[in-house]
């Protein structure tokens, strides 16, 4: 019994740095439990951009702090991430861990590539 | 730099109780599942028991179910195995590990403790 | 439960040497979830390998980890000295999480 997670290979943030993708997994077991982690992975440097656990049939709570908001529906989690930038550009991995109950398992997700362009700044306007 | 530092074995009869502690630094504790491997004298590594992130989930191994208490104090930075109804058996360098970003490997380890249970 | 069994229990080796270590699960180790430490004597494990193949930070290039399912293998190219040590995998996809016996490197 294996956990498999799956998410888009390429996601084009909006022009207001607003990026969204689906992490999907198929669970093992009948988990209570999940905790979703995203992990952004650039020049072999890996941070941790966000996580939430949450009960199934629940809704996603993120750290008031948090850059994503993100919902739940079976198993399935629609991620949302805020205030992107250019310099924000890279490969996005969803990580899955079923907590509750026992046995724990992992899926980890091949990645989402999320580009994000800086808006040209508007030209002034002479009226 | 990340430190794992263990304190708290010792000799104790079998039947009694010991209680084992890990003081983490130099990263974000709450971030990270902590776990309990053992190792038996001259003998090989076993997985004991994870608590992770917040400390409200908690996974043992079938050895030490029941007898086994594993927590975390976040603010302290600190990791305990509460070990109760001890046996012979138990005898092992008891090592503190941090699970790894991708997943429970483990890198970054204590230097260990040694618990013998002995009548 | 999934049961690591690795070979050979001990390998004898010369400095300069090639070693290849095996480290086979009794069920298929999902994503290829396994590790592997290094491990001296009076010592603390080291993590070498992550994800059957990623090497841990500071891991020298001459250690290298593939397989896949059921069969994983630990490569080292060349022997140095420092070498010599007890190697263990571990699988991290369920619990509960689970080591090899070992396999012992020691000079010939």
């Known amino acids: 019994k294996a956990m498999h997670v799956a998410q888009p290979a390429v996601v084009l943030a909006s022009s207001r740095g607003i990026a969204s993708f689906v992490c999907e997994y198929a669970s093992p077991g009948k988990a209570t439990e999940v905790r979703v982690t995203v992990l952004r992975q650039a020049d072999s440097q890996v941070t941790e951009v966000c996580a939430a656990t949450y009960m199934m049939g629940n809704e996603l709570t993120f750290l008031d702090d948090s850059i994503c908001t993100g919902t739940s529906s079976g198993n399935q989690v629609n991620l949302t991430i805020q205030g992107l930038r250019a310099m924000d550009t890279g490969l996005y991995i969803c990580k899955v861990e079923l907590m509750y109950p026992p046995p724990y398992y992992l899926g980890i997700g091949n990645g989402t590539q999320i580009y994000v362009i800086d808006p040209e700044p508007c030209p002034d306007s002479d009226f | 730099q990340v430190q794992l530092v263990e304190s708290g074995g010792g000799v104790v009869q079998p039947g009694r109780s010991l209680r084992l502690s890990c003081i983490a630094s130099?990263?974000?504790?709450?971030?990270?599942?902590m776990h309990w491997v053992r190792q038996a004298p001259g003998k090989g590594l076993e997985w004991v028991a994870v608590?992770?992130?917040?400390?409200?989930?908690?996974h043992y191994a079938d050895s030490v179910k029941g007898r086994f208490t594993i927590s975390r104090d976040n603010s302290k930075n600190t990791l305990y195995l509460q070990m109760n109804s001890l046996r012979a058996e138990d005898t092992a360098v008891y090592y503190c590990?941090?699970?790894?970003?991708?997943?429970?490997?483990?890198?970054?380890w204590g230097q260990g403790t040694l618990v013998t249970v002995s009548s | 439960e999934i049961v690591l069994t690795q070979s050979p229990g001990t390998l004898s080796l010369s400095p300069g040497e090639r070693a290849t270590l095996s480290c086979r699960a009794s069920?298929?180790?999902?994503?290829?979830?396994l590790a592997w430490y290094q491990q001296k004597p009076g010592q603390a494990p080291r993590l070498l390998i992550y994800?059957?193949?990623s090497r841990a930070t500071g891991i020298p290039d001459r250690f290298s980890g593939s397989g896949s399912g059921t069969d994983f293998t630990l490569t080292i190219s060349r022997l140095e000295p420092e070498d010599f040590a007890v190697y263990y995998c571990?699988?991290?996809?369920?619990?509960?999480?689970?080591f090899g016996p070992g396999t012992k490197v020691d000079i010939k």
């Open positions: 590990a941090r699970g790894g970003v991708w997943g429970p490997y483990f890198d970054y």
């Open positions: 130099g990263f974000t504790f709450s971030s990270y599942g």
């Open positions: 608590n992770w992130y917040d400390g409200s989930n908690k």
């Open positions: 069920q298929s180790v999902s994503s290829s979830y």
């Open positions: 994800g059957a193949s």
């Open positions: 571990q699988q991290y996809g369920r619990s509960p999480f689970t």
